[in-house]
């Protein structure tokens, strides 16, 4: 029998330094959490201990925070190569910007393997990236070899900008042939790594004959087995085992997020491939792991240059933009409106002649609108004011949902209203009209949403049982604010850009804002 | 020690047909796949045809295609080239190998095959 | 003709490096691993290097391999007569579904 030892991260979404216990700013050094100085020394420590390890990332290393902002995917190939990964399979925020910011910052620079079997390259691009991504890759480990076949959402094209010259096939269906191919060249340990979610992955591991293990990512699933060592509730044991269409037992593992854990699954091998055995659990990189010295002060060096760029003008605008409670909180406010209108702008995607986008409508929290800018400084807008007013560093996430939930959604924005409360919906796409004299549960009278199989947009009621998708953040995709109903009854929900990043991109593209209040939310006569 | 050791080889005329063995012994049989691989006199390496492990795919070079077949018997531990329709362009030493991983890594010591009349 | 060309001769003397190319497209070695074969006069090849630039056990590390897009090399350091033979490399072909090896290389010690 041969060990292979198997450690995974995915999602890490920019979590270059260490975070605090809910993956946002470390604030409490000695609580704090993740990071790639903490992550190295668990690795290195794995590595002396254990013969045959390899260290691999299923995707979405790019967008999270201020690092990917300013370094655009450098820091991602400088801290990778510097921890020795592997390899990596891409995820869809790697095409974030566009296949360029991919090709220059990380393709040519990663000194690993990074892997995706069903996205084919067309035209002028196909001999440009030719080589720079590979769908598998044999890597020797010991003695022997181990086949990583990579794996991204097919999804991609709508959660982030591939570009007209790339193909995203079924995952099932390109992986085979190329699983087959390893099998012909008689490499008989073959890992599925990829990007496409956790129920992806089981399909994988259930449809694919010939994979051995499946290493995933995107959809943040935490699995564990025993007690859970930190506050992430397991989806179910790790590994999860799938039993395969031909009958074997193939484990499935995902890593939660953020870098927030280290992967580590062991599996035994007969003479022939097979697994015998599969066992281990996410090891929680806390405080109690210490941060490398030398790659500590690499990730200070780097950091110099972030605290500049948070004072820098991204643009101006020209009109205050309110983002006080005493307005996000009770009515339309215009920050609300900018967020928006930033969240709609960072997910056109025209992808299909018979629609203008795939998305037009966006729902925000009043609540997770923290402060307003002044225009009165000459105007200026710098990361460090956007901070101020989105600071719980989320994403903006694309989900699908039915007319119904958006329905119930609505009424819980104003079930309580006037209490200053954070539910209170701030909207792009929609128009509201709430009557507050009638009980709650029962005081949205007009809800009208913009069309997006239309060449003119223009406002239709809703219908309750049509499937919308919906820009928000990832904390109501989640059910925060008392938004349940999100979250018992979404029908996808893909995660999507850092918050901060999406409006500062906006701001940086429109250079000068004046967003207005015009009429989105409005309250019917006598009763507001 | 893995050995490799091809048998069948001789001369056959045109359009004749002639069966190469390789029996293995030294290692588990069963848990590889093979090919031939042939060398014409004073000329360089050319593949013939593989084999997977379990058997279930074969793959042939375009000048051999429809006229050899390889085959397997795990129990036996031993492959097999089957080759009709021999042409004076098939003479060669050939070679029954092993794949590793990704690579042929064992090679037996060949067996020649003329053809001629 | 091989799809895969390799220069027919090269030469050192001992003590010295020679290397040897050989070069493919984007359906063979662009995508696929590389290895490389000796063969001694008369005797069957024995395998060199594979998965680009991995050694088996028993071949010394005066020889490596590399590869860089659809091409790959193999460098002798610290020439032998021992070393006087016919050098291959080989990969799989996505496109041929099958191995393609190089013409060979003739490598004399002088």
């Known amino acids: 029998a041969w060990e292979l030892t198997i450690l995974h991260t995915n999602d890490v979404h920019s979590r270059l330094e260490q975070t605090s216990e809910d993956s946002s700013k470390c604030v409490n050094a000695s609580r704090c959490m993740g990071g790639v100085a903490r992550l190295f020394t668990k690795v290195q420590q794995i590595r002396r201990a254990e013969p045959n390890v390899l260290l691999l990332d299923a995707g979405d290393q790019y967008q999270g925070t201020i690092w990917f902002t300013v370094y655009k995917g450098a820091e991602v190939a400088h801290f990778m190569n510097a921890l020795r990964y592997d390899a990596m399979a891409l995820g869809n925020h790697e095409f974030d910007n566009g296949v360029e910011g991919l090709i220059e910052p990380l393709l040519k620079e990663a000194k690993f393997p990074i892997l995706s079997a069903n996205i084919k390259a067309k035209g002028p691009l196909a001999s440009q990236i030719s080589g720079l991504y590979l769908p598998y890759k044999v890597l020797p480990v010991g003695d022997e070899v181990v086949g990583i076949v990579g794996y991204t959402s097919k999804e991609t094209p709508f959660l982030s900008n591939p570009g007209t010259n790339l193909v995203f096939e079924d995952e099932i269906t390109a992986l085979q042939p190329e699983v087959d191919k390893l099998k012909t060249l008689n490499v008989n340990k073959i890992i599925a790594l990829g990007h496409s979610g956790f129920e992806m992955d089981k399909l994988i591991a259930q449809k694919v004959r010939g994979v051995d293990v499946v290493v995933g990512g995107h959809s943040n699933t935490f699995l564990y087995t025993g007690n859970p060592p930190s506050k992430e509730v397991p989806a179910g044991k790790y590994p999860f085992i799938v039993t395969s269409d031909d009958g074997r037992k193939v484990p499935v593992v995902q890593a939660y997020a953020f870098g927030k854990y280290l992967g580590y699954l062991k599996i035994e091998f007969d003479e022939r491939g097979n697994v015998i055995s599969s066992h281990g659990n996410p090891i929680l990189l806390n405080s109690s792991i210490p941060e490398d010295p030398s790659i500590k002060a690499d990730i200070n060096k780097w950091r110099i240059k972030l605290d500049n760029y948070s004072t820098q003008e991204l643009g101006k605008t020209i009109v205050y933009l309110d983002g006080s409670s005493q307005s996000c909180r009770f009515r339309e406010c215009n920050m609300g409106n900018l967020i928006c209108d930033a969240m709609i702008n960072n997910n056109l995607r025209h992808t299909d002649e018979m629609f203008w986008n795939h998305v037009s409508m966006c729902i925000l929290n009043g609540g997770g609108i923290r402060s307003p800018i002044d225009e009165r400084n000459n105007g200026t807008i710098t990361w460090e004011n956007l901070a101020a007013v989105l600071p719980f560093g989320g994403t903006f996430d694309l989900v699908q949902l039915k007319g119904s939930t958006l329905k119930k959604a609505f009424e819980h924005s104003v079930h309580r209203y006037g209490q200053s409360t954070g539910e209170f919906l701030q909207v792009g796409g929609i128009h509201v009209v709430y009557d507050l004299s009638r009980k709650p549960g029962d005081r949205v009278v007009k809800l009208d949403v913009l069309c997006t199989k239309c060449r003119v947009p223009s406002y239709d009621p809703l219908k309750m049982d049509e499937v919308y998708k919906v820009i928000l953040p990832n904390f109501l995709a989640n059910g925060g604010d008392g938004f349940q109903m999100i979250k018992d009854e979404l029908l996808r929900h893909d995660s999507g850009d850092q918050d901060i990043n999406v409006v500062s991109t906006y701001i940086s593209k429109m250079k000068v804002i004046y967003p207005a209040v015009e009429g989105r939310i409005k309250f019917s006569t006598g009763s507001h | 020690e893995v050995q490799l050791l091809e048998s069948g080889g001789g001369l056959v005329q045109p359009g004749g047909s002639l069966r190469l063995s390789c029996a293995a012994s030294g290692f588990t049989f069963s848990s590889y796949a093979y090919s031939w691989v042939r060398q014409a006199p004073g000329k360089g390496l050319e593949w013939v045809s593989a084999i997977s492990g379990s058997g279930g795919s074969t793959y042939y070079a375009d000048s051999v295609k429809g006229r050899f077949t390889i085959s397997r018997d795990n129990s036996k531990n031993t492959l097999y080239l089957q080759m009709n329709s021999l042409r004076a362009e098939d003479t060669a030493v050939y070679y029954c190998a092993r794949l590793g991983y990704s690579t042929i890594d064992k090679w037996g010591r060949g067996t020649l095959v003329t053809v001629s009349s | 003709q091989s799809v895969l060309t390799q220069p027919p001769s090269a030469s050192g003397t001992p003590g010295q490096r020679v290397t040897i190319s050989c070069s493919g497209s984007l359906s063979n070695i662009g995508r696929n691993e590389v290895n490389w074969y000796q063969q001694l006069p008369g005797t069957a090849p024995k395998l060199l290097i594979y998965l680009n630039n991995q050694r088996p056990s028993g071949v010394p590390d005066r020889f490596s391999g590399s590869k860089s897009g659809t091409s790959a090399s193999l460098a002798i350091s610290g020439l032998q007569s021992e070393d006087e033979a016919d050098y291959y490399c080989?990969?799989?072909?996505?496109?041929?579904?099958?191995?393609?090896f190089g013409g060979g290389t003739k490598l004399t010690v002088l």
């Open positions: 080989a990969t799989w072909d996505d496109s041929l579904k099958g191995w393609l």
